[in-house]
């Protein structure tokens, strides 16, 4: 029996519900009475959701999945999953016995957007060329981990001198910190950029130093 | 009018190095970076690196390092390129171009001429 | 590094006919920009931002995109657009551009 679903990872935003899809060829005469789904973690081999007898069987992950009843009949085994959470992201196997049996898996890929940086400066005042000052870069709650990148007020990058730190949360998002360490010109525009590397989202702030008094774009 | 003047071509022997150079008026020359990009037949066109022209900050492409060195001379308005060990793979046409935009959001407004140069024993 | 892929390498179109050139990126890209290169001259800005004309270029120009996939339309085909032209992107170093497509004319 063959079994089939998306190549590419589903991309699922956190809090937002995701349809992992799964189908097959159901052969003339097919009643559900005769369709075994099961849908489990691929690694752990955790029950998921699961349909036997000609009867949904119910979630056995938090409540939190469904199948589409009204397409079952037609070879749509595609499983719901409400709510996504950081914590579901990873492989989902479905497999489907009628007289045959067959199996396939299909990855999950969660995703979060990342605020828009906010940037803070220290010293943050009295600040004259050739002072070195520490430049913050700060964004929020994004998955997975972010790309961060600094440019100078001309486009050009900015690698020597920079420290990143990303840390998870209760939720496994992450909060970014990017410091950047420079030698004040006679005025400067500093840019970060923080991108989410699944979503292609960028974010980026400035800030620009001309003396006083500074300003954040 | 913004313009950016590049030296003439060059007839250069395999081994030796090669100094370009890019004249730009027409604008404030402090304000915008500097980028160099080799066009070849067999390469189309390739970004070799960027020169910050105010703080002489520089960013190569990994594949140009060690062979191309910009500087720039803010008293002339003039940004330079010295290639060095030059061989046949070297030869080429040089663009400058002026870089144009702000915070991650850029492109190439204004390109040089061109500078040919020619590498052969 | 982000590619780029330009098709077709070579095309030609007859006087009036609507030209579409692609630029595919192996990267998402936050903008697309493309440059027109005459015979023995320098490449010229063509179209900014994905969509935006530069000073000087004819109405019959559009470009189009996001994300990954681009294109260059130009809407009746005119002698003067003999060309090749370049897709370039600036969202990520190192800078990169397409190989080019060149426009011939029937």
């Known amino acids: 029996l063959e079994v089939q679903v998306p190549e590419d990872p589903v991309v699922a935003l956190v809090g937002t519900d995701a349809t992992l899809c799964c189908s097959f060829s159901p052969e003339p005469g097919f009643s559900l009475a005769q369709l075994n789904l099961i849908w489990q973690l691929t690694d752990t081999k955790q029950l998921v959701h699961s349909f036997a007898e000609g009867q949904d069987q119910g979630s056995a992950y938090a409540n939190r999945t469904a199948l589409f009843p009204d397409l079952l009949a037609q070879g749509n085994a595609s499983l719901r999953l409400q709510r996504v959470r950081v914590a579901d992201e990873g492989s989902f196997t479905c497999f489907v016995s009628i007289r045959d049996f067959g199996s396939a898996a299909v990855s999950l890929q969660v995703a979060a957007p990342y605020s828009k940086p906010s940037m803070t400066l220290e010293p943050n005042k009295d600040l004259r060329p050739g002072d070195t000052v520490t430049i913050t870069c700060s964004s929020y709650r994004g998955y997975p981990e972010a790309e961060v990148f600094w440019q100078d007020g001309q486009g050009v990058p900015l690698t020597g001198n920079v420290t990143t730190s990303q840390m998870a949360n209760e939720q496994g998002l992450f909060d970014v910190h990017s410091v950047l360490r420079v030698v004040l010109g006679a005025n400067g525009t500093y840019s970060c950029l923080v991108r989410n590397p699944v979503l292609q989202q960028d974010a980026h702030g400035s800030v620009t130093i001309t003396g006083q008094p500074m300003t954040f774009p | 009018e913004v313009q950016l003047q590049q030296s003439g071509p060059e007839l250069v022997r395999p081994g030796v190095s090669v100094k370009i150079s890019c004249k730009g008026s027409g604008y404030t020359f402090t304000d915008y970076s500097m980028h160099w990009v080799k066009q070849s037949h067999a390469k189309s066109l390739e970004w070799i690196g960027v020169i910050n022209t105010s703080s002489g900050n520089t960013y190569y492409n990994l594949k140009f390092k060690g062979k191309a060195t910009m500087t720039v001379d803010k008293s002339s308005s003039t940004a330079y390129m010295e290639l060095a060990r030059l061989t046949s793979e070297d030869s080429a046409i040089y663009y400058c171009?002026?870089?144009?935009?702000?915070?991650?959001?850029?492109?190439?407004?204004?390109w040089g001429a061109g500078t040919t140069v020619t590498v052969s024993s | 590094d982000i590619v780029m892929t330009q098709s077709p390498v070579i095309m030609s179109a007859s006087p009036g006919e609507k030209v579409t050139m692609t630029c595919s990126a192996s990267s998402s890209v936050s903008y697309m920009h493309w440059y027109q290169q005459k015979s023995s001259t320098s490449p010229k800005l063509w179209i900014y931002d994905t969509s935006k004309l530069a000073s000087g270029v004819p109405g019959r120009f559009s470009g189009t995109g996001s994300g990954k996939s681009h294109s260059l339309t130009i809407s009746s085909m005119e002698a003067e657009d003999v060309a090749t032209y370049y897709c370039?992107?600036?969202?990520?170093?190192?800078?990169?551009f397409g190989s080019g497509t060149k426009l011939e004319i029937k």
């Open positions: 171009s002026k870089y144009y935009g702000s915070s991650f959001h850029w492109y190439f407004d204004v």
């Open positions: 370039f992107q600036g969202s990520g170093y190192p800078l990169t």
